[in-house]
Every structure is written in structure tokens, then in C-alpha cells.
């Protein structure tokens, strides 16, 4: 039987009446164009909705936008367009919402041609009031808030000027010209690249990387011959052109660009690219594109310095620079990532790692699922997950995989069961153990969202026809109830719930169409009365993450420690609540060789856990140099995996080797670095 249709399902009593009393409709008095929605702050209930309507005329575009505000999670909206003087807001810039609970909002307006600069509307009280400010430049990008101080903004102008404001957009100062890319670092530091000979495109590979730590009073050139740069965790990466040819290499700094080391990664040619897939303060996942137009590359994982890299996954699907990759961090369980590989026969298969890229495997076939037509053996196959690539290929996949840090272990995704991703209509699958095992949750494609830290899952069928039914589950997707939220079906455009999955409100967005007009409409449903009581101790049970064999003393050990969690029982219908904090208990594991990666100059032969010294490295593709600093180049061949907390057990000690004489290249020697002031 289909999920939720057998006698196993515990029904939620009187749910229709409870939900009907908590369903709020709002019809927007606009013509249907585009709509964008932003949450302002956390747990504030404030939502801003911007509707825009474009009419392309012969010479220009006529546009109208309206701004609405809700302060009750979308149950009621108020038209506040007058607060922005009925100005047309540029949708491509969206609404720039300040970090954390700053309550700051910046809207960028469309201004008529010939004006000296752009115009913004600023609010610092959660969009209750706005101040109009005319800019001394035309913005090219959305305003970027400093993560440390929401009063500090930066923006690039259409003339490639780098502009900074220290008083939340009231006054602006151009701190540098000829800027290609600018990013906030930590401690209000700004990193940016500049060109010398005319344009960013013309100077690609000859850019300079600059840093200012005082909002433009002084500058330091921290890199030359730069192709691009990126920030990930505590690492600053620069892609640098080689002296002798058109290849480039990654260099990494962990001190904001004062010193650099060459990453032990292959160099790439003009048509190739590097991409930081994920980064934290411990390590980095780096994708290195394969030569030629293959659509795939290799994932490498770094050591704690971002210098030494281990090959993690071959034939990793990544179409082009800025193109599509299915790489997904499963945020509901530590160490878990999912992605796709392009196999030799050009089929796409899903792979999962539970140990931060150490090993990759196929996803286990869901119980009670049949292998589809892609499977050679009808009894042996895997689950394959649809993510960004499938969406880009216009397959019938309305949503990417979903996981939330506070809904421990839960992963929801579209997928197919076979030897590879299928172009057939997918179903929705759920895992409650971070991707180790899966169950079919819903037949056919759906939109889905997690509420109340996993206490409720909500879904809406993906259909070209108007809809009026929402499905919900209080037991992690085992059983489903359906609720008709309106008599008059709407053309559905999206589900919206407050980021963080702590809310119990869901908004269903769509439009109604009549003979002459179509209007935006939203239905906000509050599930608070479905989960009538607060959860108590008896509603939770203890779960060991990553458990595979209880008879193994180290069962559950991942990166040197195991974690037990208190998890809501599937049968408990109660509120985790907005203040819910995941209760977990770590315990340290004994070290094994699996807890170490091979340091520079060493490698692991296939099916061996020991690190063996590489043959002579001179001229080797993976050569690197740390200014020949001796202390960096002494190694016993092993290095603890970043984030690994193991203690005791195996301690790989061997003769310490000095690899300084094997160092054969350099970058940005200190004399090349110079300081400049405004």
C-alpha cells in the first residue's frame, strides 16, 4: 500500500476543525507578475513581500511594484508601498536583509535614466519605517552587509568602483576604483580584486588581490596574477596564473593573505575551473574540473591547513563554472554529504559519504521498493537523488533535497530506484538516519518543508492543475493526512516557512485566474493546535548516529567521536517548540589509522591504511612550497583528519622527514607584497 494508507497510521483527531480555525487567506490587490518574499529577523514573524509587474513598451519598460508587510508569520499583510513612495523596486537586487536580528532592510529602487546615481530605501526597525537615500553611484550588485557589523555596507558600482558605507547606507565613500569582485572577510575586513588594463575580463589572470582592514583607510596588495579568489571557513583561496604557461593553481592563506602556501592540487587550464563545494573552520571540499568539456571533475578534501589534499571522489558531476552540481551538505547529521557522479556510460549516479568525504558509497535501496528500468539486476540497485542538475534539466523535480540541523537525521529528497538517475517521474523519499536508510514517503513529485524541528512535515503535490489540498505528517513521513485549505483551487507557486524549521506556520502561495485578471493569494496555516501539548521527556528516545554494528566496540564513531541524540518518538504528537535545542551527547573514540590522512609527500596505496612515502617529488604535478620554511615541511607522514577528536588508540609515530629539499616552486614571495594607503 502507498505510504500512509495502511492501518499502521495513527490519525490526528479533529484536525480539519483545528486547521480550519487556523487558516488565513490574503488576496493581494495586484496583477500577477513576480513575487519575492523575505523573512526579516528570526522569530519576529515579520515577512516582506515585493510584487512586481513589468510591461515592456517599445522604448522602455513600465514597471510597478508593491510592498507588503506581515508581522504574524503571513496571516495578515498590510500594503506599505507608500513607505517607499510608490517607487519601483528592482527585483534583480531583491531585498537585502541584514544579518541576525538586526532588523535592517535595504531595497534598491529603479531610477529613471540620466540620474547621477541610484536610490535605496533603508529600514532598521524590521520594515516599519523606511528612509529614502539617493546614492552617488549606480549599484551593480546588491548591498552587502558586514557579518560583524550590520551598519557597514559595501557595493560595487556599474563603473567598477568599490563603495563603502559605515552608517547603514546614509553616507557612501568610494574606496577604490577598477574593482572586479569584493567580499567581506572576518573582522570587517574587505578582500577585492582590481584590474589595471581596462576591464575585469581583459585582465583575468592578471588581477591583483587587495585587502583593507579599516574600511578603506589603508590597503595591502596580498596577491598578484590572480584569476579569482574565494573565502571558505577560515581559508582564503586564490587561483593564481603560473609563470610559464596559461595554467593556474590554488594558493591558500589562513592569516587573511599575509602568507600563502600552494595547495597540493592539480593545476588547471583555461577551460577548467576550481570550486569550493563546502568549507568550515576545519577543512574544505574542493572540486577540480577535468580537462576538456567532460562535465565532471574530482573532489579533494583538505587537511586543517588547506594545503594537503586527499582525493575524495572521481568523476564528480559539475557541468561548467557556476553551472550545476548536486553536491549537498546534509545538515541534519555531521559528516554527511550527497552528490552525483557521471559514470563511464554517461548515466548519473548518487553517492553519499558519512565521514566527510573519506569514503563514498551508493545509497541503500529503500525497503519495499522495486528497481526501475535502469537496473540490470532487478534485486540489486540503489536510490538516486534528484538535486540541482535534475532541476536544471527541467525534469519533474520541484525541489532539491532538504535537511535541517534541528531536525536530526531527517533528509527528504526526490529520487528514483535503479542503477542511475531516471528521467521518469520521481517519488519523494525520506531518511531518518542521515541518509543511511530510506523509505518512500510520497508518490510522485511534491513540494515539502519541515516545521517544528521535524515534528511536522508538510507537502503539496507538484501539479500543473490548480490545487487546494495540503498533506501533513506528524511521524516523520510515515503517515499522511490531507487537508483542504480552500474551496477554490489555486495555481500553486510555492511553499514558504520561516528559515530554521522552528515555525509551525506554513504559507501556500499561488494565484487565482479569472476571465480578465489573475491575482496573488496566500494561505497561511498554523499547525499549533495539531500539536496540542509541549513535548516532555517521555516523548523523546535515545539514538546513536552512524550506528552500523552494535557488536563493534567503536560503533557510531565518525571523525573520532560518536554522538547520541535525544529524538522525538515518531508516535509522539507534541510541540518541540521554538526554543527547542537538539540534545546530544558526544563520546570520544580511540584513534585508528582511519583517523589520519597522509601528509604531503605520502600516499595510501589502494586497500591499505598505512601512509607510504611517495617516490621523488621533483617536477611532480602535486609539488608545493611553503617558502621553504623548515618547520612546515617536517612530517611523520600522517596528519589528523580535520575535526577528528579521537584520543588514545593508534598513534602513528615514525621517523620525521625533512621535505624542504623537495620544494620546487614558490608564489608571492614577501618582496612582492607592498602596502599602499589612500
Amino acid at each position: 500500500s502507498a505510504p500512509g494508507e495502511d492501518e499502521e497510521c495513527g490519525r490526528v483527531r479533529d484536525f480539519v476543525a483545528k486547521l480550519a480555525n487556523n487558516t488565513h487567506q490574503h488576496v493581494f490587490d495586484d496583477l500577477r507578475g513576480s513575487v519575492s518574499l523575505s523573512w526579516v529577523g528570526d522569530s519576529t514573524g515579520v515577512i516582506l513581500v515585493l510584487t512586481t509587474f513589468h510591461v515592456p513598451l517599445v522604448i522602455m519598460t513600465f514597471g510597478q511594484s508593491k510592498l507588503y508587510r506581515s508581522e504574524d508569520y503571513g496571516k495578515n499583510f498590510k500594503d506599505i508601498t507608500d513607505l517607499i513612495n510608490n517607487t519601483f523596486i528592482r527585483t534583480e537586487f531583491g531585498m537585502a536583509i541584514g544579518p541576525e536580528n538586526s532588523g535592517k532592510v535595504v531595497l534598491t529602487a529603479e531610477v529613471s535614466g540620466g540620474s547621477r546615481g541610484g536610490r535605496i530605501f533603508r529600514s532598521s526597525d524590521f520594515a516599519k519605517n523606511f528612509v529614502q537615500t539617493d546614492l552617488p553611484f549606480h549599484p551593480l550588485t546588491q548591498m552587502m552587509y558586514s557579518p560583524q557589523n550590520s551598519d557597514y555596507l559595501l557595493a560595487l558600482s556599474t563603473e567598477n568602483g568599490l563603495w563603502v558605507s559605515k552608517n547603514f547606507g546614509g553616507k557612501w565613500e568610494e574606496i577604490h576604483k577598477a574593482v572586479c569582485l569584493a567580499k567581506w572577510g572576518s573582522d570587517n575586513t574587505i578582500f577585492f580584486t582590481t584590474y589595471a588594463n581596462g576591464s575585469c575580463k581583459a585582465d583575468l589572470g592578471a588581477l591583483e588581490l587587495w585587502r583593507t582592514s579599516d574600511l578603506g583607510k589603508s590597503f595591502k596588495t596580498i596577491g598578484v596574477k590572480i584569476y579569482s579568489f574565494g573565502l571558505g571557513g577560515r581559508f582564503l583561496f586564490a587561483s593564481v596564473m603560473a609563470d610559464k604557461d596559461t595554467t593556474r593553481r590554488i594558493h591558500v592563506s589562513t592569516d587573511q593573505g599575509d602568507t600563502w602556501s600552494m595547495a597540493q592540487l592539480p593545476s588547471v587550464g583555461q577551460e577548467q575551473f576550481y570550486s569550493i563545494l563546502a568549507a568550515n573552520d576545519d577543512m574544505v571540499f574542493m572540486h577540480v574540473d577535468e580537462p576538456g568539456d567532460t562535465g565532471f571533475g574530482t573532489i579533494f578534501t583538505s587537511d586543517d591547513r588547506g594545503i594537503v589534499y586527499s582525493k575524495s571522489l572521481d568523476r564528480h558531476l559539475y557541468t561548467t563554472t557556476g553551472g550545476e552540481t548536486d553536491f549537498t551538505n546534509v545538515t541534519s547529521l555531521r559528516g554527511v554529504y550527497i552528490t552525483s557522479v557521471l559514470s563511464e556510460d554517461n548515466s548519473i549516479q548518487t553517492m553519499i559519504t558519512f565521514d566527510q568525504g573519506g569514503r563514498w558509497t551508493h545509497l541503500r535501496k529503500p525497503e519495499n521498493s522495486e528497481c526501475d528500468a535502469t537496473a540490470k539486476n532487478k534485486n540489486e540497485c540503489s536510490l538516486h537523488i534528484h538535486a540541482s542538475y535534475s532541476i536544471s534539466q527541467k525534469l519533474n523535480v520541484p525541489m532539491a533535497p532538504l535537511s535541517e540541523p534541528n531536525a536530526v537525521g531527517i533528509v527528504i529528497a526526490h529520487g528514483s530506484v535503479g542503477d542511475a538517475i531516471s528521467v521518469m517521474v520521481p517519488d519523494v523519499y525520506i531518511s531518518d538516519d542521515g541518509g543511511a536508510s530510506w523509505t518512500k514517503m510520497l508518490e510522485g513529485p511534491h513540494y515539502y518543508t519541515i516545521l517544528d524541528s521535524g515534528g511536522i512535515i508538510v507537502a503539496i503535490e507538484h501539479s500543473s492543475r490548480p490545487i487546494n489540498v495540503i498533506k501533513f505528517s506528524t511521524d516523520e513521513g510515515q503517515c499522511w493526512q490531507t487537508y483542504t485549505f480552500t474551496r477554490d483551487p489555486i495555481y500553486f507557486t510555492g511553499l514558504a516557512s520561516e528559515p530554521g524549521a522552528r515555525s509551525m506556520n506554513i504559507s501556500i502561495w499561488g494565484f487565482t485566474e479569472s476571465f480578465l485578471t489573475s491575482q496573488w493569494v496566500s494561505y497561511t496555516i498554523d499547525f499549533k493546535d495539531i500539536l496540542e501539548r509541549n513535548c516532555e521527556e517521555k516523548d523523546y528516545t535515545i539514538w546513536l548516529a552512524h550506528s552500523t554494528d552494535p557488536e563493534d566496540y567503536e560503533d557510531g564513531c565518525i571523525l573520532g567521536y560518536k554522538e547520541q541524540f535525544l529524538r522525538l518518538r515518531k508516535s509522539s504528537v507534541c510541540q518541540n517548540g521554538r526554543d527547542y535545542v537538539v540534545t546530544k551527547q558526544p563520546s570520544i573514540c580511540l584513534c585508528s589509522l582511519e583517523d589520519f590522512l597522509c601528509d604531503f609527500g605520502y600516499y595510501r596505496p589502494e586497500n591499505d591504511s598505512k601512509c607510504v612515502e611517495q617516490p621523488e617529488l621533483k617536477g611532480h604535478d602535486l609539488e608545493f612550497c611553503l617558502y621553504g620554511r623548515e618547520e612546515h615541511l617536517t612530517t611523520n607522514g600522517y596528519r589528523k583528519i580535520p575535526g577528528d577528536k579521537c584520543q588514545g588508540g593508534v598513534n602513528p609515530v615514525r621517523e620525521v622527514k625533512d621535505l624542504k629539499k623537495k620544494c620546487t616552486s614558490n608564489f608571492l614571495s614577501p618582496e612582492k607584497q607592498n602596502s599602499k594607503s589612500n
Partner: antibody, heavy 124, light 106 residues
Framework: QVQLVQSGAEVKKPGSSVKVSCKAS????????ISWVRQAPGQGLEWMGG????????NYAQKFQGRVTITADESTSTAYMELSSLRSEDTAVYYC?????????????????WGQGTTVTVSS | DIQMTQSPSTLSASVGDRVTITCRAS??????LAWYQQKPGKAPKLLIY???SLESGVPSRFSGSGSGTEFTLTISSLQPDDFATYYC????????FGGGTKVEIK
């Protein structure tokens, strides 16, 4: 083969406490929950509570909350159950049992290994 | 807490009989139910876990079924060694046992 060996029979006065031990051998004690179940003469089985040796995470049946304390010592692979404020109706055979485990959930798969039982008699 | 109601409380049967014991939960417990056999003066022995999975070493004449709130233990052909008391136990909440069913010789 996993075995659970419990301490010997006890005779206690009302109002006093009793502490029963349960020593595991031949398996990975730390990775399984240990439950305590009692059976009064001629009666059925009654779950009192359980503990997971890793981290010492204990939980108790509502009926015994505040009166029972379950602990575990990983180094000796031993679990303990202490029941205080004893009354005559606490006279029973007390069993420790290992919770079988097939996944990360500790308490869902039944109790697959049992101790031999410890008779506790409460009498003035 | 979840209540478990077992029936019948006593059952008289002969060797070779097919015996069925039922257990009802006061609320849905999915498939989280175990069955035990206990003989006088001995500790209980696990027969079935997760409603229908047979514990290793248990004869295949024992089988379990059901989900949600209604569960059944079946002994397809009663053997002399099977005369004992049987308990169901739910695990989807603080653990609770049924009252027991004594299977005696007719």
C-alpha cells in the same frame, strides 16, 4: 556469547535501599542499553528503567521516578539498579536485560539477553 | 504511558494446536512490539521483535503480525516445550508489558 550475571538475593527492611548489580561478559556492553524489569510473586513483568553505558544516559518509568537510580560502570561492564524507600510491595525478582539493537535506536528491538534474576525480599 | 491489553489471560490447548494470542495497544505503536516466553522460575526469553521479526534461534512455528494497535502471536503447532506464559511488550514510549497469557495443557 553474551551473559548477564546478577548479584545475589537480598532481604531488606521497609524504608531501606537495595542495590543490585548486573555484570556483562562476552560482548560490547557499552553499545547496548540495559533495562531493569521486576516481577512480583505471581505477577507480570514491569519495566523500571534503563541506561546506556556510553554517557550514562538513564531513563525511568514514571512509577519509579525519584525512587530508582540506574547507573553503569563501563570499565567493569557492570550496571546497577538502586531502589530506595523500600516497601513490602517491592518484594520481587529483579532482572537486568540487554536491549537488542539493529539500528541507532536503543530501546525498540526487545530484550534479547537476560540476567538470572535477583530476589529482593522486603520484610520487617 | 501506553497500556497493553493481552488476551486471553489463560489459554488451554493441546499439542499440535494452532494457538493465537492477541495484544492491543492504547495508541498506535507502529511495529514496535516484542513477544516473550517465560517458564516458572526462569527469566523471559525473546521470541519476536519489531512485531514480526523472529529472534535467532527461535523455532519457526512462532510468528508475529500486526501494526498500529493490534498485534498477534501465533504458534502454528503447539509443542510440549511451548507451555508457558507469554508477554507482549511495546517499545514506542516508556516500555510497558501486557498482563501475560498462560498457555496450559488442555
Amino acid at each position: 556469547q553474551v551473559q548477564l550475571v546478577q548479584s545475589g538475593a537480598e532481604v531488606k527492611k521497609p524504608g531501606s535501599s537495595v542495590k543490585v548489580s548486573c555484570k556483562a561478559s562476552g560482548g560490547t556492553f557499552r553499545n547496548y542499553a540495559i533495562s531493569w524489569v521486576r516481577q512480583a510473586p505471581g505477577q507480570g513483568l514491569e519495566w523500571m528503567g534503563g541506561i546506556i553505558p556510553i554517557g550514562g544516559w538513564a531513563n525511568y518509568a514514571q512509577k519509579f521516578q525519584g525512587r530508582v537510580t540506574i547507573t553503569a560502570d563501563e570499565s567493569t561492564s557492570t550496571a546497577y539498579m538502586e531502589l530506595s524507600s523500600l516497601r513490602s510491595e517491592d518484594t520481587a525478582v529483579y532482572y537486568c536485560a540487554r536491549q537488542g539493537r539493529k539500528t541507532g535506536y536503543y530501546y525498540y528491538y526487545g530484550m534479547d539477553v537476560w540476567g538470572q534474576g535477583t530476589t529482593v525480599t522486603v520484610s520487617s | 504511558d501506553i497500556q497493553m491489553t493481552q488476551s486471553p489471560s489463560t489459554l488451554s490447548a493441546s499439542v499440535g494446536d494452532r494457538v493465537t494470542i492477541t495484544c492491543r495497544a492504547s495508541q498506535s505503536i507502529s511495529s514496535w512490539l516484542a513477544w516473550y516466553q517465560q517458564k516458572p522460575g526462569k527469566a523471559p526469553k525473546l521470541l519476536i521483535y519489531k512485531a514480526s521479526s523472529l529472534e535467532s534461534g527461535v523455532p519457526s512455528r512462532f510468528s508475529g503480525s500486526g501494526s498500529g494497535t493490534e498485534f498477534t502471536l501465533t504458534i502454528s503447532s503447539l509443542q510440549p516445550d511451548d507451555f508457558a506464559t507469554y508477554y507482549c511488550q511495546q517499545a514506542d514510549g516508556h516500555i510497558t508489558f501486557g498482563g501475560g497469557t498462560k498457555v496450559e495443557i488442555k
